[in-house]
Amino acid sequence: QPSVSPGEPSPPSIHPAKSELIVRVGNEIRLLCIDPGFVKWTFEILDETNENKQNEWITEKAEATNTGKYTCTNKHGLSSSIYVFVRDPAKLFLVDRSLYGKEDNDTLVRCPLTDPEVTSYSLKGCQGKPLPKDLRFVPDPKAGITIKSVKRAYHRLCLHCSADQEGKSVLSDKFILKVRPAFKAVPVVSVSKASYLLREGEEFTVTCTIKDVSSSVYSTWKRENSQTKLQEKYNSWHHGDFNYERQATLTISSARVNDSGVFMCYANNTFGSANVTTTLEVVDKGFINIFPMINTTVFVNDGENVDLIVEYEAFPKPEHQQWIYMNRTFTDKWEDYPKSENESNIRYVSELHLTRLKGTEGGTYTFLVSNSDVNASIAFNVYVNTKPEILTYDRLVNGMLQCVAAGFPEPTIDWYFCPGTEQRCSASVLPVDVQTLNASGPPFGKLVVQSSIDSSAFKHNGTVECKAYNDVGKTSAYFNFAFKGNNKEQIHPHTLFTP
C-alpha cells in the first residue's frame, strides 16, 4: 500500500493488502476499502465499468466475469487498486470480440485471463492455420494480447487467444480482425469530360470518379470562385477490401449562360488532396464559325489543282454541308470530317478538291453549313491564270493593224517591227488604241484586250509582231509586209508561240 508524509492526503488502503488476488470460482470476494473519506469502488474489465458506493465490496459466489481491476477512490480523488483473478477451469478467457485495427497502429485482442498461472499465453490462427509470419504480439494477462503494427494483409484474419492449462491447449472464442487502411497516397480523381458546351436550358451532368483505399475519403464538387453548395448524387462500390470507388455526379437540370465556368471535383484524405476540373460553357443559342485555311481569293494556273479548305466550329453538330459552284452542288470531290475524335469536339474540316482547272472554271465556290440553330457560308473567289491566246489579228480597211488577245491576268499587247528579213523584232511600235473589251462583263474568266497600230508608219518591207503576254506566258502573231510600188500588201499573217 502507498505511504505519504503526514499532513498530505493519502490514498485509501485495501484489505487484503495485495496488488493481485486469486479466487476460485464459487468462492467469496471480499474487499475492504479503508479511508475516512471513502467515495466509491469501481470495477473495470474489458473497458466496461461498474460502481459501488459501499466501502466493502462483497461478491458471495465469484464468477469468471468478476475477474478484473477493483479500484477504491477517496474524496481527494486518490485511489488504490487490486486485481482479482477468478480462476474458472471452464472459462479461461474473458472475451470481447470487438477487434478493430488501424493499419500501422497497435490493436488489442481483448481476452484477459482468469488464471494468471497458465502458460504459453499467445495468439493462434483459426482451424490450425498459421498466423502471418510478420505478425508480432505482446501478451498481458490482465488486458489481452496486443498485435503490434497492424498490416493491411491482416484484414479479416481469424484468430484465437490460446493458453496451456494443465498441459492442454485451450482456445478462446474466435476473433475476426477488421483492419482500416491508412491513407498512404492522395485520392485518384478523374472526370467524365474535361469540357462541356451546352445551349441554354439543356441539362449539365458531369461525373467525378474518386478512387481510394476506403470510403472515408472526402469528396465534393465546387464551383471555382463560389461558395454555393452544389447538388450532387453518389454511387459507390467496394472492389475488394481496399479498393473503393465513388462516383459523384453533379447536375444542373436547366443550364443558364451564367452557369458557365470552371467546376472542380475535390477529394482529400489524411494523406493529402487531389482535384480535377471541368469547364462548362453555356451559350444562348447554337453557332457556326467558319475559318478559311487558305486565302478566300485564289489564283491558280490553268491545268493545275487546288484544294479549298475550311475549318469550322459548329454547335450543335452540323447537319448539312455543301459546296456550290454556279448554282450547282458538288456531289463528289469534297470531304467533311471532324477535326478530332474527342466526344467534345466541335471543330470540323471540309475540303473541296478541284483538279486540272480550266480557264472556264474560275468563279465563286461557296461552302454552306447548317445545324439546328444557324446557317453559315463562306465564298472562295477562284481565278484561273491562263496564258494569252490571240483571238484575231487583222489589217483593217482603214489601214490599222488590230490584235485581239484573251487571258488572265489581263494580257499586255506589245508591237514590234522587224525590217527586211531580220528575225529579231526589236523596234517597238506604240499602239494607237488599246481597249479591254470585257472589263464590265463577268468578274471571272479571261480578259480580252484589243490593241491597234497604224500600218502607214511602215515604209519598208518587213514583219510586224503582235506579242500578247501576262504572268503565265506569251503568244505572238506576225504580219508580213511587201511593197509593190506604192502599194503595201499584207502577206499571210501567222502566229508563233513563244513560251
Epitope: L46, D47, E48, T49, N50, D96, R97, S98, L99, Y100, K102, N105, L108, R110, R156, F175, I176, K178, R180, S214, S215, S216, W237, H238, Y244
Partner: antibody, heavy 116, light 107 residues
C-alpha cells in the same frame, strides 16, 4: 453496466443546426465504436455515422456534407452536429455501441422535430 | 454504397408457420450481417450477428443463414411476442446500411 443516453433539443427550426449528445457509461470510447442511427416516424432505420475507437469518423454518403461527429473521451460523450435541417430530418435519433457482435447496446433514442 | 434489399415488406403468419425474411446485398459482404428486432416505441434489439450466431438471451427458434449474397432470418414456430419490425444491417464497410424492414404480424 453499459448504458447510452441521447440528449438534445426536441424541436429545431428549419435551416438551423441540430446538436445531439450521446453520453455513455460502463465502457470506454477508446475501445468501442459508437454509431448514430435515425428513424423518421413510421419509417425504416437509417445509419447516420460512426465514431471509431481511435477518433476517426465515417458518415452516411447522403448526409456527409452537413454532418459532423466528434467526441470528448474524458466526459464519455459523442456529439452529432447536422446543419441545414429540413422537415425530412425529423426522426428519432439513436446512438448505439458496436462490437464485432453487432450493435449490442442502444440508447432509448431522442425525437427531433424540424418545424417552424 | 452497399444496398440491402429486404423482403417481404410485411407478412402475417400463424403460430405454427416457419417465417423467413431475406436480405440481398448488392455486393459481397462476407459474414458481416446482423439482424435486429424493433417493437413500437422501443430501440432495436440485436438478434443475430455474423449471419448465424445468436445474441445473448435470444431464443433458439431464431436462426440465420447465407447463400452467396442472400441472407435469411428464420423464425420457426413464432410466438406472439415476436411481432415487430425486423431489420438486417451490413457492417462489411462504411457507410453501413440497413434493409428497409419487414413488419411481422402474428395471427
Amino acid at each position: 453496466q453499459v448504458q447510452l443516453k441521447e440528449s438534445g433539443p426536441g424541436l429545431v427550426q428549419p435551416s438551423q443546426t441540430l446538436s445531439l449528445t450521446c453520453t455513455v457509461s460502463g465502457f470506454s470510447l477508446t475501445s468501442y465504436l459508437v454509431h448514430w442511427v435515425r428513424q423518421p416516424p413510421g419509417k425504416t432505420l437509417e445509419w447516420v455515422g460512426l465514431m471509431w475507437n481511435d477518433g476517426d469518423t465515417s458518415y452516411n454518403s447522403a448526409l456527409k456534407s452537413r454532418l459532423s461527429i466528434s467526441r470528448d473521451t474524458s466526459k464519455s460523450q459523442v456529439f452529432l452536429k447536422m446543419h441545414s435541417l429540413q422537415a425530412e430530418d425529423t426522426a428519432t435519433y439513436y446512438c448505439a455501441r458496436e462490437s464485432n457482435l453487432g450493435f449490442t447496446y442502444w440508447g432509448h433514442g431522442t425525437l427531433v422535430t424540424v418545424s417552424s | 454504397d452497399i444496398q440491402m434489399t429486404q423482403s417481404p415488406a410485411s407478412l402475417s403468419a400463424s403460430l405454427e408457420e416457419i417465417v423467413t425474411i431475406t436480405c440481398k446485398a448488392s455486393q459481397g459482404i462476407d459474414d458481416d450481417l446482423s439482424w435486429y428486432q424493433q417493437k413500437p416505441g422501443k430501440s432495436p434489439q440485436l438478434l443475430i450477428y455474423d449471419v448465424t450466431r445468436l445474441a445473448d438471451g435470444v431464443p433458439s427458434r431464431f436462426s440465420g443463414s447465407r447463400s452467396g449474397t442472400q441472407y435469411s432470418l428464420k423464425i420457426s414456430r413464432p410466438q406472439v411476442a415476436d411481432s415487430g419490425i425486423y431489420y438486417c444491417l451490413q457492417s462489411y464497410s462504411t457507410p453501413y446500411t440497413f434493409g428497409a424492414g419487414t413488419k411481422l404480424e402474428l395471427k
